[in-house]
Amino acid sequence: MAVTACQGLGFVVSLIGIAGIIAATCMDQWSTQDLYNNPVTAVFNYQGLWRSCVRESSGFTECRGYFTLLGLPAMLQAVRALMIVGIVLGAIGLLVSIFALKCIRIGSMEDSAKANMTLTSGIMFIVSGLCAIAGVSVFANMLVTNFWMSTANMYTGMGGMVQTVQTRYTFGAALFVGWVAGGLTLIGGVMMCIACRGLAPEETNYKAVSYHASGHSVAYKPGGFKASTGFGSNTKNKKIYDGGARTEDEVQSYPSKHDYV
């Protein structure tokens, strides 16, 4: 039950995270005009990964796409790439994890296959989340660098009689959405990996194997299991170690070759 819950929760958290990464990537407010030094502006500028926008006080908003590929800063291209890779990996991860969900039955898919798929999707979510966090962080670093550069320009270029409005940009809403979404995808991925451990039938953890001696029957349980007399008398005992909190009867729906002799 706990495995199913962990897997399901991991899937939902990752789904929310990937939706957030997609939203952040599409948002126009990656950087917004810093109004600290110019609170009286009647024109507000903000920029995204794909276009820059201007919102006038009158309510009129105009957005212009970056119609050049080669003319864009390498950092912006890198951020775009990271976000797209994050979305693609996340989307594939979601697709894989849907089939890996314990609550969904697809043909006669074994637990080992579901475990592998859960692990795969978990790793994909982790990488997707890291890509998003990295992309947003690179952009944030770019903003901070440009902010202080333009601040320096602002104070060195004030010698003349005519002042010019130096537009500085600060963190936009998309950055925070991206960080949170990336974090959620990462957490979801970790949860999927944890769930995978509970799903996997561990080859080293054998169930009771009977050895019929000449006088009486003795059940031998290797590797951390205590020996007990009587055939099959302890089949509902909990294992001493196991990836997930499961009783032995819970895994008997898919018997393995090691079950009984």
Epitope: N38, V43, V54, E56, S57, S58, Q163, T164, V165
Partner: antibody, heavy 118, light 113 residues
Framework: EVQLVQSGAEVKKPGASVKVSCKAS????????LIWVRQAPGQGLEWIGT????????NYNQKFKDRATLTVDKSTSTAYMELSSLRSEDTAVYYC???????????WGQGTLVTVSS | DIVMTQSPDSLSVGLGERATINCKSS????????????LTWYQQKPGQPPKLLIY???ARQSGVPDRFSGSGSGTDFTLTISSLQAEDVAVYYC?????????FGQGTKVEIK
Amino acid sequence: EVQLVQSGAEVKKPGASVKVSCKASGYTFTSSWLIWVRQAPGQGLEWIGTIVPSDSYTNYNQKFKDRATLTVDKSTSTAYMELSSLRSEDTAVYYCTRFRTGNSFDYWGQGTLVTVSS
Amino acid sequence: DIVMTQSPDSLSVGLGERATINCKSSQSVLNSGNQKNYLTWYQQKPGQPPKLLIYWAVARQSGVPDRFSGSGSGTDFTLTISSLQAEDVAVYYCQNSIAYPFTFGQGTKVEIK
């Protein structure tokens, strides 16, 4: 056709208040911000403030912040500008105008002459 | 506040001749975000409210004759009437549209010589 029709001329005593109305028609009232501008006799134009009819958000010129109050009545598509503690230098023609693209004022009311005299 | 200064204060031009009005702002009205200058020109005839002629320094308002044109960038702007007509006799104002408070020039009176 967009129209902004203002109330008639007013004569007030110093220290009194005046409330000028501006009825809008020919467009969706809540879709465009409204501006109030005044023009003293033989003088230039002076921005008083801005009001957003949809949510009544206002932005005032610091010069008028304490004395001017901009309001709207969405049910009648009417904007109001009230100026208190009137002085003789407040004698002017008061205009309401629509705020549009480029932060420009595209349609204007005919103006309301407010005379402050003792 | 941005101070708008117009020159000349008045201008006498013959019918059909070119009239040029200058406007200088104390601060740049160029917005880096869209590379547009937030400067607006109005025409005011006696006893009438102002009429919008040009916004974004160069964009002509619909219905405005094409003899009216705007130019300039940053802090220096020009309104040109390529061929003055009798109905163009008015006072012309430039306005800062980039920052609050919105400020206007003192006006330039255009007359026929």
